[in-house]
Amino acid sequence: GELETSDVVTVVLGQDAKLPCFYRGDSGEQVGQVAWARVDAGEGAQELALLHSKYGLHVSPAYEGRVEQPPPPRNPLDGSVLLRNAVQADEGEYECRVSTFPAGSFQARLRLRVLVPPLPSLNPGPALEEGQGLTLAASCTAEGSPAPSVTWDTEVKGTTSSRSFKHSRSAAVTSEFHLVPSRSMNGQPLTCVVSHPGLLQDQRITHILHVSFLAEASVRGLEDQNLWHIGREGAMLKCLSEGQPPPSYNWTRLDGPLPSGVRVDGDTLGFPPLTTEHSGIYVCHVSNEFSSRDSQVTVDVLDPQEDSGKQVDLVSAS
């Protein structure tokens, strides 16, 4: 017969490691006992457990509560054991020695590797503002054993750079995502993706981009000057802009204070029934924490009688 095991067994930190040892014997052969030992413990072999066909499992004091048999059903030729709650200190070599009847003793070694999965973290860069050059949007760091892989998943155009630092049998990886901020990036997701053999699936951390900007301001409402005549009701001017953070609006009159009865409602300036004293230069001032913009318009309130009188004069002059 012969022993079947694995050259290398890999287990995730905190999980249970199955140490395989199966005797593939000829018919009629029996396994009397299986002795498990750690064989790289420095001072010779360190016994883990003894698996006896008649008396069951005996675990050595150093591994009390940490070594078990796999759950049933069990094959009498299977000397595999479970090492519970693996820690990094368990990395090393293990040997199973199988005593069989009538073939004698066999032994096999395996190497146990413990994977330490990463706990990634994402750190946003400095505040992003339109008009900046290439700027750090976010950095993502993950440390594990072996080295994790850190990539980015996003629709945003940018460049990545990564650096890694190795310790003994583990590595810390940091990847940075740089971009040239523009308003179109606002609200776009930037996702750090971390891969590692100790993770069942990639870990993803998403950061939503916020780019500060302030668009040019413009004023709507004067498209048809003929509507701005004495006595007209419901006349209004609306200031148009957009920004991140959302901007605030302020209205002033360049050639004096706002006339009485004129209502300021955020981006809108509402007029009472128009009179000639509403004529003037009005300024919309738009601002947010990033910038400020101004737009000014000239309101010229028409007197219909004055206009028709002028027309008569023109006619008579002809």
């Epitope: 420095g42 072996p146 003994s168």
Partner: antibody, heavy 116, light 108 residues
């Protein structure tokens, strides 16, 4: 700094054995596995196996089972690779390498020539 | 065993050009277990990239690695005269450890 220094070139006859040494310095010798990799002239890299300097435990590639023996002497931080029953196609440069998952440091290589 | 196939076998380029080297694996390999090495004539291999995308200590940032599953890539953004060499990929996640057959980057 980490260094792996190997023994000098060898010329052997078919059927003979060769033993190549690899002396480590600049780190704790027993803290890292040592692997052996060979490269025939004009060919690629071929993994031969590893030794755990702490325990002396070994694992050999199937192709070399029965012909290769890896040992170590922790008192002088040196690993050894012995290949027996040499054939002409064993002519190669033999490298030792330190394992930190990947192979982060390599010896300079030892040329073994098998010729009658 | 996991077989690694590198392409192309030889890459003829001029200094300053971009080099893209491919490594395909016969079975899926975790990116954490893939490395790239550079070997110049008469020298031992040197670790360039580990964990598929992480540059080893002292490796210039013109070298970058990427990929996952069965497809991995080594990119040299602008070839310097000292970059003309043979490049090997390696998987170290399962036994036996295996290498690709190598890609030679030569001066055009």
């Amino acid at each position: 700094q980490v260094q792996l220094v190997q023994s000098g070139a060898e010329v052997k006859k078919p059927g003979a054995s060769v033993k190549v040494s690899c002396k480590a310095s600049g780190y704790t010798f027993t803290g890292y596995y040592i692997h052996w990799v060979r490269q025939a002239p004009g060919q690629g890299l071929e993994w031969m196996g590893w030794i755990n300097p702490n325990s002396g435990g070994t694992n050999y590639a199937q192709k070399f089972q029965g012909r290769v023996t890896m040992t170590r002497d922790t008192s002088i931080s040196t690993a050894y690779m012995e290949l027996s029953r040499l054939r002409s196609d064993d002519t190669a440069v033999y490298y030792c390498a330190r394992e930190d998952w990947d192979f982060d440091y390599w010896g300079q290589g030892t040329l073994v020539t098998v010729s009658s | 065993e996991i077989v690694l196939t590198q392409s192309p076998g030889t890459l003829s380029l001029s200094p300053g050009e971009r080099a893209t080297l491919s490594c395909r694996t016969s079975q899926s390999v975790s990116s954490s277990y893939l490395a790239w090495y550079q070997q110049k004539p008469g020298q031992a291999p040197r670790l360039l990239i580990y964990g598929a995308s992480n540059r080893a200590t002292g490796i210039p940032d013109r070298f970058s690695g990427s990929g996952s599953g069965t497809d991995f890539t080594l990119t040299i953004s602008r070839l310097e005269p000292e970059d003309f060499a043979v490049y090997y990929c390696q998987q170290y996640g399962s036994s036996p450890i295996t290498f690709g057959q190598g890609t030679k980057v030569e001066i055009k």
